[in-house]
């Protein structure tokens, strides 16, 4: 294991990717720790402002967490010769607020990418596809981890954050081979309609700890390989028949629904019936009514149709302000 001491270079990395000399096979960038045996480079919590240019060619696992990268430009990891072995790239918690188109180009083996805990005010639609073609070359990515990438309110662009993330996921149909997608803790109010249709290979989808109120316009139908669907800690009130039928039709799926504020009124009847017979939902006997008040804390599985009523809607003449 070689380790570059911080005394060897305290200046930020400024050399451009294109002009960089080919790195020596066993070279380790300043402020990083390298293990050729483990094919791993760790440049962690070093306040780096740019991706090191002199990464060793053997690198398979690259940790660039806890830095101050701010912007990931096009070709941020492009090298001559390319980093052909790089398979896992972790950029979490590095204060990225902008990921530009083509940021991950020229990484032919990149299977896992973690951008979690970066306040991404701008995520290019071509961040993962690398080009603006309607159909791009397939990305090698198999796992994409985007937990807690929502920027603070004052840094948000005018367009919806959900839409920005969705555009990057569907661009060029590049992520058709993606197996795992984590989008937890992003304040999502909705899931854009066409996203899942473009990710047919998904096996694991984590949408937990968002603010999803409804899945009415989301289709899971073509996710035939889906094994785990995490919807815990959202704001779901009820699942309607269309969603229930789609979930039931997925051959391998397990669905996690804990910590949603279920509204146990007449609209809940179909979901209760489904819950009683499905094996899809994990920990289904923990699901508990939050509203209305008279139903609070009741177990959904123990409800029957007589319990599930809706207050009659008064005609306008009887309504009071």
């Amino acid at each position: 294991t070689s380790s570059a001491s911080s005394s060897s270079s305290s200046a930020p990395f400024l050399a451009s990717a294109a002009s960089a000399q080919p790195p020596l096979p066993d070279q380790c960038p300043a402020l990083c720790e390298c293990s050729e045996a483990a094919r791993t480079v760790k440049c962690v919590n070093r306040n780096l402002t740019e991706v090191p240019t002199d990464l060793p060619l053997y690198v398979r696992n690259l940790f660039l967490t806890g830095n101050q990268l701010a912007v990931l430009p096009a070709g941020a990891f492009a090298r001559r010769p390319p980093l052909a072995e790089l398979a896992a790239l972790n950029l979490s918690g590095s204060r990225l607020d902008e990921v530009r188109g083509g940021a991950f180009e020229h990484l032919p083996s990149l299977r896992q990418l973690d951008l979690s805990h970066n306040p991404l005010a701008y995520l290019s639609p071509f961040a993962f596809s690398g080009s603006n073609a309607s159909i791009s070359a397939p990305s090698p990515l198999v796992e994409l981890i985007l937990n807690h990438i929502v920027p603070p309110d004052d840094k948000r662009q005018n367009r919806s954050f959900e839409g920005m993330v969705a555009a990057a996921l569907v661009a060029g149909r590049a992520l058709q081979g993606l197996h795992l997608l984590e989008l937890a803790s992003n304040h999502f109010l909705y899931l854009p309609r066409d996203v899942l249709a473009q990710l047919p290979s998904l096996r694991y989808l984590d949408l937990s700890n968002n603010s999803l109120v409804s899945l009415t316009y989301v289709s899971f139908r073509n996710l035939t390989h889906l094994e785990s669907l995490h919807l815990e800690d959202n704001a779901l009130k009820v699942l309607h028949n269309g969603t229930l039928a789609e979930l039931q039709g997925l051959p391998h799926v397990r669905v996690f629904l804990d910590n949603n504020p279920w509204v146990c009124d007449c609209h809940m009847a179909d979901m209760v019936t489904w819950l009683k017979q499905t094996g899809v939902v994990q920990g289904k006997d923990r699901l508990t009514c939050a509203f209305p008040e008279k139903m609070r804390n009741r177990v959904l599985l123990e409800l029957n149709s007589a319990d599930l009523d809706c207050d009659p809607i008064l005609p306008p003449s009887l309504q009071t302000s």
Epitope: E232, D233, D258, N259, G283, D285, R286, L287, T288, C289, A290, R296, N297, R298, V299, L301, E302, L303
Partner: antibody, heavy 116, light 107 residues
Framework: QVQLQQPGTELVKPGASVKLSCKAS????????MHWVKQRPEQGLEWIGN????????NYNEKFKNKATLTVDKSSSTAYMQLSSLTFEDSAVYYC?????????WGQGTTLTVSS | QVVLTQSPAIMSASPGEKVTMTCSAS?????MHWYQQRSGTSPKRWIY???KLTSGVPARFSGSGSGTSYSLTISSMEAEDAATYYC??????????FGGGTKLEIR
């Protein structure tokens, strides 16, 4: 009015076991999870575990996994907690509480004293 | 696992005084509940879902907060409010966690 009735006191010797009871009335017993909470003298509240009276499913605080066993008798709408291998540290007030998102009704608590 | 920290641990207030106690979560939570426990009695749910008062709780009590910071306020302290108050995480799955409590005494 929902009620959870617990015996007032239990006195047991170190090393022994005890089975605390909590009898529920005036609601559908199987429709709500039942929780157990420990409170040592002048201390805070500590969640022990819970049980679904409908199917007997349980969850435990890791700390109490080898100490507490939760059961129910649906016919009498009674929840039980057995505490084993008692030590002086187990001396406390034990509450049952009906709950889901929160604990909306509590028993009066059973004061367990472990003394030789 | 989320840790709840209440402050202050002990406080005293004169009748008519405004009282505020806080509950800080180690990570963001959606809602918080509060329980009142008078000396020698079992706890009672006092405030739920951050700001809703349980039936029978006097209107001088209020709850507020979001994210990692929550508070319980008494607009005008009365003798019967002397008790220990516990916050509890909004959850329907284990584990259920309580704060360490704030003991409120009458001055």
């Amino acid at each position: 009015q929902v009620q959870l009735q617990q015996p007032g006191t239990e006195l047991v010797k170190p090393g022994a076991s005890v089975k605390l009871s909590c009898k529920a009335s005036d609601y559908t017993f199987t429709s709500y999870w039942m929780h157990w909470v420990k409170q040592r003298p002048e201390q805070g509240l500590e969640w022990i575990g819970n049980i679904n009276p409908s199917n007997g499913n349980t969850n435990y605080n890791e700390k109490f996994k080898n100490k507490a066993t939760l059961t129910v008798d649906k016919s009498s709408s009674t929840a039980y907690m057995q505490l084993s291998s008692l030590t002086f540290e187990d001396s406390a007030v034990y509450y049952c509480a009906r709950g889901g998102w929160d604990f909306d009704y509590w028993g009066q608590g059973t004061t367990l004293t472990v003394s030789s | 696992q989320v840790v709840l920290t209440q402050s202050p641990a002990i406080m005293s207030a004169s009748p008519g005084e405004k009282v505020t106690m806080t509950c800080s979560a180690s990570s963001s939570v959606r809602y918080m509940h509060w329980y009142q426990q008078r000396s020698g009695t079992s706890p009672k749910r006092w405030i739920y879902d951050t700001s809703k008062l349980t039936s029978g709780v006097p209107a001088r009590f209020s709850g507020s907060g979001s994210g990692t910071s929550y508070s319980l306020t008494i607009s005008s302290m009365e003798a019967e409010d002397a008790a220990t108050y516990y916050c509890q995480l909004w959850t329907s799955k284990p584990p259920w966690t309580f704060g360490g409590g704030t003991k409120l005494e009458i001055r």
